[in-house]
Structures are given as C-alpha cells and as structure tokens.
Amino acid sequence: HTAAQDNCTCPTNKMTVCSPDGPGGRCQCRALGSGMAVDCSTLTSKCLLLKARMSAPKNARTLVRPSEHALVDNDGLYDPDCDPEGRFKARQCNQTSVCWCVNSVGVRRTDKGDLSLRCDELVRTHHILIDLRHRPTAGAFNHSDLDAELRRLFRERYRLHPKFVAAVHYEQPTIQIELRQNTSQKAAGDVDIGDAAYYFERDIKGESLFQGRGGLDLRVRGEPLQVERTLIYYLDEIPPKFSMKRLT
C-alpha cells in the first residue's frame, strides 16, 4: 500500500497533501514544500521532511541540540535542496550565497564557503550513534529487555532492517543505539539509517511524523522510559573536511 485509501492520508508522513488523483483514482500524497510524490508505505527522506518543516508554520526549532563534538548537527534548521530521489544534494547554499557540503543525513561536513565551493559527491553517513539519557527510575532497566524493545521499535515502527541496528549499549542512565549501514549493505527498498534516526529523534521530542498514530510512548516491560536528553553523532564513510581553527 502507498497511502490509506479510505480517507486518503499518508500513514508515514503527516506533512503531506493527499488526493485521489493517482493512477486509477488511487490516493497519492505529495510532501509539503517540495511537492514531490512520496511512498507512504515507508519513511519519507529526511531532506523532504526538512523542506516540509521549513514550509510549515512554527519553524524556529533547532534540529538537534548543539554540542562541541564533530558531526553533531550544530547548524540548526535550514531549507535544503533535495535531488529528484529526495536525497540531500551534496552542496547546500542559503539565500545569501553561503554554501557548504553535507553528508547523506544533511549535516554540514565542511567549512562554509561561497558559490565557488565544490562538493564532488554526497558522502554517505554509515554509522549513527544515538545517545540518550533517561530520567531517573526506581532501578536500572534490564539490559536485554531494553535491547529487545529498542530493536523491535526500529524494526516495527521505522521499518529498519534488524541487521542495521548494530548494538544497544546501556549504562544507567545513558542508552546508546548504534546504527550502521554501508553503501554496499543498503539494498533497494531498505530504510536509510539517517531517515530512521530522524523519525526517532522527532518521536523522542514529541513531534511524531506519523499520521494519526499515538506519539511514541517508550516503555520497557511496562516501565516508561522517559528521555531527558538526546545527542546524535554522525560518522561518514569519508572523514569531514574542516579547517583546524574550527577544532580549537
């Protein structure tokens, strides 16, 4: 299925406009901002979601909290350029002709430059580390229960193949979820780890992208898991290129 036929909505992306104007009167949904048709049986790409978010009201939120670590998304929200497949274009520029190169999850990986800046290829983010801190609980969560629940969440809610959830680490109160997906591993139809991580991030913040689904009520064996801090680290297949002054 692509979109819910009965009331013509997109189950996996609420930031869409849907109408029964597809082939044979089928429900077809287009992303806000870009107008691109989306496949509602899977996650929408992060690039199209960011573009839709910029076109919607109340768009002053930052993407993830700033951190001093490399390849944490410090730049906040921007209106990205997406290619015809909905992926980030390797070079992004703002209205003042400031340009930079991004990786496959849209995070800046070079210093900012001008329109002469070249970004030869879209570098793939092959390893994502999601670092969560949960609110105090009576006791620690059982590690194997937590591991199973988070793996199930990524498989069933985000449709990410289990082989891409490399590990779940837990040292109370810190939970780390490692997602790994090389270019060679990702087959046609596989959900991208960057898209899954973005949906998860929005869910954690109480800003679910799913249509009409309850927000993410994270529980482990009935115990609520309330996240009070999220940091997401991105590792690219090719190291980023920043000048040394940025690192001081």
């Epitope: 199973a148 629940e149 793996r151 199930r152 969440l153 069933e156 809610r157 289990p162 689904r213 309850g214 927000g215 993410l216 009520d217 994270l218 529980r219 482990v220 064996r221 009935g222 609520p224 898991l225």
Partner: antibody, heavy 123, light 107 residues
Framework: QVQLVQSGAEVKKPGASVKVSCKAS????????MHWVRQAPGQGLEWMGI????????VYAQKFQGRVTMTRDTSTSTVYMELSSLRSEDTAVYYC????????????????WGQGTLVTVSS | DIQMTQSPSSLSASVGDRVTITCRAS??????LNWYQQKPGKAPKLLIY???SLQSGVPSRFSGSGSGTDFTLTISSLQPEDFATYYC?????????FGQGTKLEIK
C-alpha cells in the same frame, strides 16, 4: 490484586451494535494497555485491538477496522469496546486483557484477563 | 500479518507424562512469544511470557524455549489440572495473532 470485571451477556439483532465494558482495579489504570480478544463458540482466540488508556490511542485488527471502537474513561478506570453492524459470525465471548506493554503500540503479554462477555447475535 | 502455527492440534497423554507443544511463526518474532492455558468456560491464563519466562504463580513444571520462529512449551510431568487447551501468541507486532490451539486430553 489486579481485577478486570466485564459487563454482562448481551443478545443483539443483526445490524445492531454492542458496547462491552471492562472495569479495571488493583493497578494504575493508565500505566498498562488493554487488549480485546474474542472467541467464537468452539473456536480459537482472535485478537481485535489494543487501547492505550493514558492517551486513548488505538490500533485495531484490519478485520474489524471501521466496525470496532475502543474507548476509555479514566475517571472510572473502565475501557469499552463497541462493535457495530453485528452479524451472526460475531457471536462470541469477548475478553478484555491487560498488557504491561512495550513502546506503544507494542505488546508484551496479556497477564490478566476479564471473565468474558458472551455476545449472541441472532434474528 | 504474522501467522502462528501450533502442533499438534490435539494430544492425548497420561498423568506423569512429559508433553511438548510447538509453535512456529511465519517470520522472526525474536522472543516475543507467550503461552496461555484455557479451560472450558474460563478466560485464558498466562503461563509463559517472552518465550521462556515463567509467569508468577505458575508451577515450575511448565517451561518455554525458542527464539526467532520456533518455540516450544514443555510440561515436564502432567498433572490432572493440566488437561486444557494451550495457545501461543506473538506479541511482536500488530495484529497480535494466536496459534489455533492445542487441546491436551487424558489418554
């Protein structure tokens, strides 16, 4: 101790609706999910849907989509299951069952069950 | 939907016997598999959750094993009160399907 007490048996005509209640006690009502499962005479168990009493989110089995509505009343710690457009094949015992739950709408196990409500659909 | 297939559908055994019931899922469900016991006219009762964890108050003669797609419920030494119908259920993803049941009868 945990208890789920369901409403009494019902006899309905085809095309009518039935609303079965399930009153919970002995635990924090909004801290667990509630499922509805039915069992036709001499048959196996059939899952109908799940409700999260803390936010009233629901997920229904495709078979019952459009005919079933699950609601809750937190003031009385009661969940309700309404089934419309009844037909003879809906004759069954309807059970509510508690679930400590994983992340919504993920189940863990149905650890406590109501006593069941027999709904008979007959003209 | 995930299909759950139990075998056998019925089984005759004697008090003191060791009995094994199997359940197969149509796709991997990790260890999200539960076993229930139901007696005529009564609601089902949870015996085993998460494939191998014994529910509180359930006698230790009941045990469960398995992961992925193949699961087993074992009763080590049948007691008279164990004659009932047993159901497996996957709690991995909606719809939370049950096996068709295994009726355990006295030989």
């Amino acid at each position: 101790q945990v208890q789920l007490v369901q409403s009494g048996a019902e006899v309905k005509k085809p095309g009518a609706s039935v609303k079965v209640s399930c009153k919970a006690s002995g635990y924090t009502f909004t801290g667990s999910y509630m499922h509805w499962v039915r069992q036709a005479p001499g048959q196996g168990l059939e899952w109908m849907g799940i409700i999260n009493p803390s936010g009233e989110s629901t997920v229904y089995a495709q078979k019952f989509q459009g005919r079933v509505t699950m609601t809750r009343d937190t003031s009385t710690s009661t969940v309700y299951m309404e089934l419309s457009s009844l037909r003879s094949e809906d004759t069954a015992v309807y059970y509510c069952a508690r679930d400590p739950g994983g992340s919504w709408p993920f189940s863990y196990a149905l650890d406590y069950w109501g006593q069941g409500t027999l709904v008979t659909v007959s003209s | 939907d995930i299909q759950m297939t139990q075998s056998p559908s019925s089984l005759s055994a004697s008090v003191g016997d060791r009995v094994t019931i199997t359940c197969r899922a149509s796709q991997s469900i990790s260890s999200y598999l539960n076993w229930y016991q139901q007696k005529p006219g009564k609601a089902p009762k949870l015996l085993i959750y998460a494939a191998s964890s014994l529910q509180s108050g359930v006698p230790s003669r009941f045990s469960g094993s398995g992961s992925g797609t193949d699961f087993t419920l074992t009763i080590s030494s049948l007691q008279p009160e164990d004659f009932a119908t047993y159901y497996c259920q996957q709690s991995y993803s909606t719809p939370y399907t049950f096996g068709q049941g295994t009726k355990l009868e006295i030989k």
